[in-house]
Amino acid sequence: SLAADTPTACCFSYTSRQIPQNFIADYFETSSQCSKPGVIFLTKRSRQVCADPSEEWVQKYVSDLELSA
């Protein structure tokens, strides 16, 4: 779940399942003001999904997105 809009959004819960990588268009990280860290993936259908950055798949997706930018 998200609080507010993108740049200041916080994650209060994380997706419980891995999103297929080819569904993801972009990502951003939640603010350092948030109570817990989070990565928000933007899907190609314009959904925003909170993911846990301590999950290996999240780290890989973020890295792949940054290196392909």
Epitope: E29, T30, S32, V39, D52, P53, S54, E56, V58
Partner: nanobody, 113 residues
Framework: EVQLVESGGGLVQPGGSLRLSCVAS????????LGWYRQVPGGQRELVAS???????NYAESVKGRFTISRDNFKNTVYLQMDNLKPEDTAVYYC???????WGQGTQVTVSS
């Protein structure tokens, strides 16, 4: 409070080597992916190399075969071994944990003859 302290930069001749270190505190280090980024004056910060909590690595095309990222979870430290350095590697290098976009002061790497 999350803190990241980078070190190991300096002036080196083309073809030389440097090893950068980044010590992190304030996070459960072993759980997070870590990345080394670099920034040139007036440019954007770009990811150079990353390593996941499980040890999988990923590199920018421009540094593949020359740079090696590693981590020591007991020392809360991530390293960047930089070999066969080129003038275009000149930049300020920063480390960061994925999902905790905090930055240290960076360490300057200058490759020049």
């Amino acid at each position: 409070e999350v803190q990241l302290v980078e070190s190991g930069g300096g002036l080196v001749q083309p073809g030389g080597s440097l090893r950068l270190s980044c010590v992190a505190s304030g996070i459960n280090f072993s759980r997070y992916g870590l990345g080394w980024y670099r920034q040139v004056p007036g440019g954007q910060r770009e990811l150079v190399a990353s390593i996941t909590s499980g040890g999988s690595t990923n590199y920018a095309e421009s540094v593949k075969g020359r740079f090696t990222i590693s981590r020591d979870n007991f020392k809360n430290t991530v390293y960047l071994q930089m070999d066969n350095l080129k003038p275009e590697d000149t930049a300020v290098y920063y480390c960061s944990a994925i999902g905790w976009r905090y930055w240290g002061q960076g360490t300057q790497v200058t490759v020049s003859s």
